[in-house]
């Protein structure tokens, strides 16, 4: 059920998964001058049961110059730090994928990790897009792409996002002179939350084992 291709590229936009479906793999890559420890994991795998998902295996890097004397530091899985047993959802808030069964949060960094992360996504994975600095979205609502299985092949849906350049005079997209207001919250901003049904998690299943490689700059 691995996705064949990478998520679509949108000009002047980057994308990120808010959570990773069970079955997602993350390559254990080390930065220059370091390598995986001998007998170390090749990848981390998002696994779980009906109530809890977490990353199996742990990536460990050691200096290429040393044999095997380097002390390794293993960070705590992010699920243990961040997972809440119950998270109250505001009725106007979209579902937080990472709080649902069957999804792992972003894995925490490991020591001497490469700057680029290579993910292998599975069917049902959703990624969200955001325009890069200096560009604004024509529509600010969430722009997502989902890996779907149709007729035995996987494909990513096309995100509805156009990032347009701004005049050089503005600091960054949307910069304008704000109106003065006596209190912290401007009067025009009282009830402006946008909702959409597109947030619902895709639950399609599939049965293909071809690989999709996705690289992302890890911040």
């Amino acid at each position: 059920e691995l996705c064949d291709d990478d998520p679509p590229e949108i000009p002047h936009a980057t994308f990120k998964a808010m959570a990773y479906k069970e079955g997602t793999m993350l390559n254990c890559e080390c930065k220059r001058g370091f390598r995986r420890i001998k007998s170390g994991s090749l990848y981390m795998l998002c696994t779980g049961n009906s109530s809890h998902s977490s990353w199996d295996n742990q990536c460990q890097c050691t200096s290429s110059a040393t044999r095997n004397t380097t002390k390794q530091v293993t960070p705590q899985p992010e699920e243990q730090k961040e997972r809440k047993t119950t998270e109250m959802q505001s009725p106007m808030q979209p579902v937080d994928q990472a709080s649902l069964p069957g999804h792992c949060r972003e894995p925490p960094p490991w020591e001497n990790e490469a700057t680029e992360r290579i993910y292998h996504f599975v069917v049902g994975q959703m990624v969200y897009y955001q325009c890069v600095q200096g560009y604004r979205a024509l529509h600010r609502g969430p722009a997502e792409s989902v890996c779907k299985m149709t007729h035995g092949k996987t494909r990513w849906t096309q995100p509805q996002l156009i990032c347009t350049g701004e005049m050089e005079t503005s600091q960054f997209p949307g910069e304008e002179k704000p109106q003065a207001s006596p209190e912290g919250r401007p009067e025009s901003e009282t009830s402006c939350l946008v909702t959409t049904t597109d947030f619902q998690i895709q639950t399609e299943m599939a049965a293909t084992m071809e690989t999709s490689i996705f690289t992302t700059e890890y911040q």
């Epitope: 808030q93 969430p142 722009a143 901003e189």
Partner: nanobody, 127 residues
Framework: QVQLVESGGGLVQAGGSLRLSCAAT????????MGWFRRAPGKEREFVAA????????YFADSVKGRFTISRDNGKNMVYLQMNSLKPEDTAVYYC????????????????????WGQGTQVTVSS
């Protein structure tokens, strides 16, 4: 009920540092762009800094670039503003704000993009 609570303000001498914190409750924090704004006495509200929900982008007003940094901790539902090399003109009430739109497909420096606001914390920089 969305609540943003700022802390960390105070009186500091010019050249000093302060770290402002903003605790968010009642919203899915990791899905929102977060920003800091400020209002000096007798002036209009001014954008200071923002950080995107995907933590891939941080933006700063020209007046604070190189002096202020913004960060967030999605595990603790916190956003921070580290202010170094403070100047008297940085004196203002600083407000934490959350974007109207979860998973917004861009960032904005305009106050109208932010629908949730804290009560503010006073920062005074003496010369």
């Amino acid at each position: 009920q969305v609540q943003l609570v700022e802390s960390g303000g105070g009186l500091v001498q010019a050249g000093g540092s302060l770290r402002l914190s903003c605790a968010a409750t009642g919203l899915t924090f990791r899905q929102h762009n977060m920003g800091w704004f400020r209002r000096a006495p007798g002036k209009e509200r001014e954008f200071v800094a923002a950080i995107s929900w995907n933590v891939g982008s941080t933006y700063f007003a020209d007046s604070v670039k190189g002096r202020f940094t913004i960060s967030r901790d999605n595990g603790k539902n916190m956003v921070y503003l580290q202010m170094n090399s403070l100047k008297p003109e940085d004196t203002a009430v600083y407000y934490c704000a959350a974007d109207n739109i979860p998973l917004a497909s861009d960032m904005r420096a305009t106050a109208t993009a932010y629908g949730y606001w804290g009560q503010g914390t006073q920062v005074t920089v003496s010369s």
